[in-house]
């Protein structure tokens, strides 16, 4: 099949890193500097991505693969292939249009990115707050209030009822 395809289209013989020149009898020519072709048989080379500004080069462009970027310190990647860099904030903050702002009471963010999220509502699961939440940490839920009432234990099963006339041994 490949041989038949090659007879039909001479460009299919051009490997990655080259292009099939429309203007020169479809000969395979190497991609020029700052361009690449990642697949064979291409008629044009793609322009290399340039990691400028807040972007920094994680992987250089080659004749067969595009450059890959990440973000300079203080920023993190967003989007497919790190298409954007977003400013980091401290834990306990979120990024707004006006910059990094502390999480409102009742919310937290344990990362340098993303938004402040509400503390877990322990009572929805029938539990109580074991450790209070902060701007940086969610609350820790513990056993339910009923489990903590005097004489009750959530760990040991209740003792069997004693028969009358028997004293404990």
């Amino acid at each position: 099949f490949e041989r038949t395809r090659s007879l039909q289209d001479p460009c299919s013989n051009c490997p990655a890193g080259t292009f099939c020149d429309n203007n020169r009898n479809q000969i395979c020519s190497p991609c020029p500097p700052n361009s690449f072709s990642s697949a064979g048989g291409q008629r044009t080379c793609d322009i290399c991505r340039q990691c400028k500004g807040v972007f920094r080069t994680r992987k250089e462009c080659s004749s067969t693969s595009n450059a890959e970027c990440d973000c300079t310190p203080g920023f993190h990647c967003l989007g497919a292939g790190c298409s954007m860099c977003e400013q980091d904030c401290k834990q306990g903050q979120e990024l707004t249009k006006k910059g990094c702002k502390d999480c409102c009471f009742g919310t937290f963010n344990d990362q340098k990115r993303g938004i402040c999220r509400p503390w877990t509502n322990c009572s929805l699961d029938g539990k109580s707050v074991l450790v209070n939440g902060t701007k940086e940490r969610d609350v820790v839920c513990g056993p339910s209030p009923a489990d903590l009432s005097p004489g009750a234990s959530s760990v040991t099963p209740p003792a069997p009822a004693r028969e009358p006339g028997h004293s404990p041994q």
Partner: antibody, heavy 121, light 112 residues
């Protein structure tokens, strides 16, 4: 040949998609560019698409326009949220790469006749 | 982004005369040569005149001549005809995945 269509009067914020239909060649063989000219202004580069479908935009056009290929002969330009400043004639052109560089060189030829987009409330 | 500055505008000359339009780039174009010239008339699409700084596009009369390299380019129109009245634009190719192309501001040619 190259021909644009889809230009019309739209209100600000209403997305609009322009179409560039080519004949006599395949979009996979060439870079294609979109250029516009606002009334009384000069030519302004919007962006290009490679034969393999990769897109590149002018910095001012990023996020405001989307170039896509819907078939081997049909290219689209979407104006995501038009403003009155986007009122212009929009042109589509092939990059002939007559010097054989293998990528876009600015040898834009042929051009379509253009399609007029008017953004007004 | 690079800037292409065209001078002068407008430029005027008599039929049979010669006009020279300059295109000054703030940064060198790719290969010092990837610069094109276009003719634009009202109601018509641009027309490619010169590519790769000095190569004449197909069907363009040899009265149009492009020259220059790097950051300084010139379009010369000799034996001026009335039909040459138009606005002329240069465009440069840059090694960037954004602002890959930049157009000059245009130069109007008036034929007297």
């Amino acid at each position: 040949s190259v021909e644009e269509s889809g230009g019309r009067l739209v209100t600000p914020g209403t997305p609009l998609t322009l179409t560039c239909t080519v004949s006599g060649f395949s979009l996979s063989d060439y870079y294609m560019t979109w250029v516009r000219q606002a009334p009384g202004k000069g030519l302004e580069y919007i962006g290009i698409m490679s034969g393999s479908g990769s897109t590149y935009y002018a910095s001012w056009a990023k996020g405001r326009f989307t170039i896509s290929k819907t078939s081997s002969t049909t290219l689209e330009l979407k104006i995501t949220s038009p403003t009155t400043e986007d009122t212009a004639i929009y042109f589509c052109a092939r990059d002939g790469d007559y010097a054989g560089w293998g990528y876009a060189t600015g040898a834009f030829d042929p051009w379509g006749p253009g399609t007029l987009v008017t953004v007004s409330s | 982004a690079a800037v292409l500055t065209q001078t002068p505008s407008p430029v005027s000359a008599a039929v049979g005369g010669t006009v020279t339009i300059s295109c000054q780039a703030s940064q060198s174009v790719v290969g010092n040569s990837l610069l094109s010239w276009f003719q634009k008339k009202p109601g018509q699409p641009p027309k490619l005149l010169i590519y790769s700084a000095s190569s004449l596009a197909s069907g363009v009369p040899s009265r149009f001549k492009g020259s220059g390299s790097g950051t300084q380019f010139t379009l010369t129109i000799s034996d001026l005809e009335s039909d040459d009245a138009a606005t002329y634009y240069c465009t440069g190719r840059y090694n960037s995945d954004t602002d890959t192309f930049v157009f000059g501001g245009g130069t109007e040619v008036v034929v007297k």
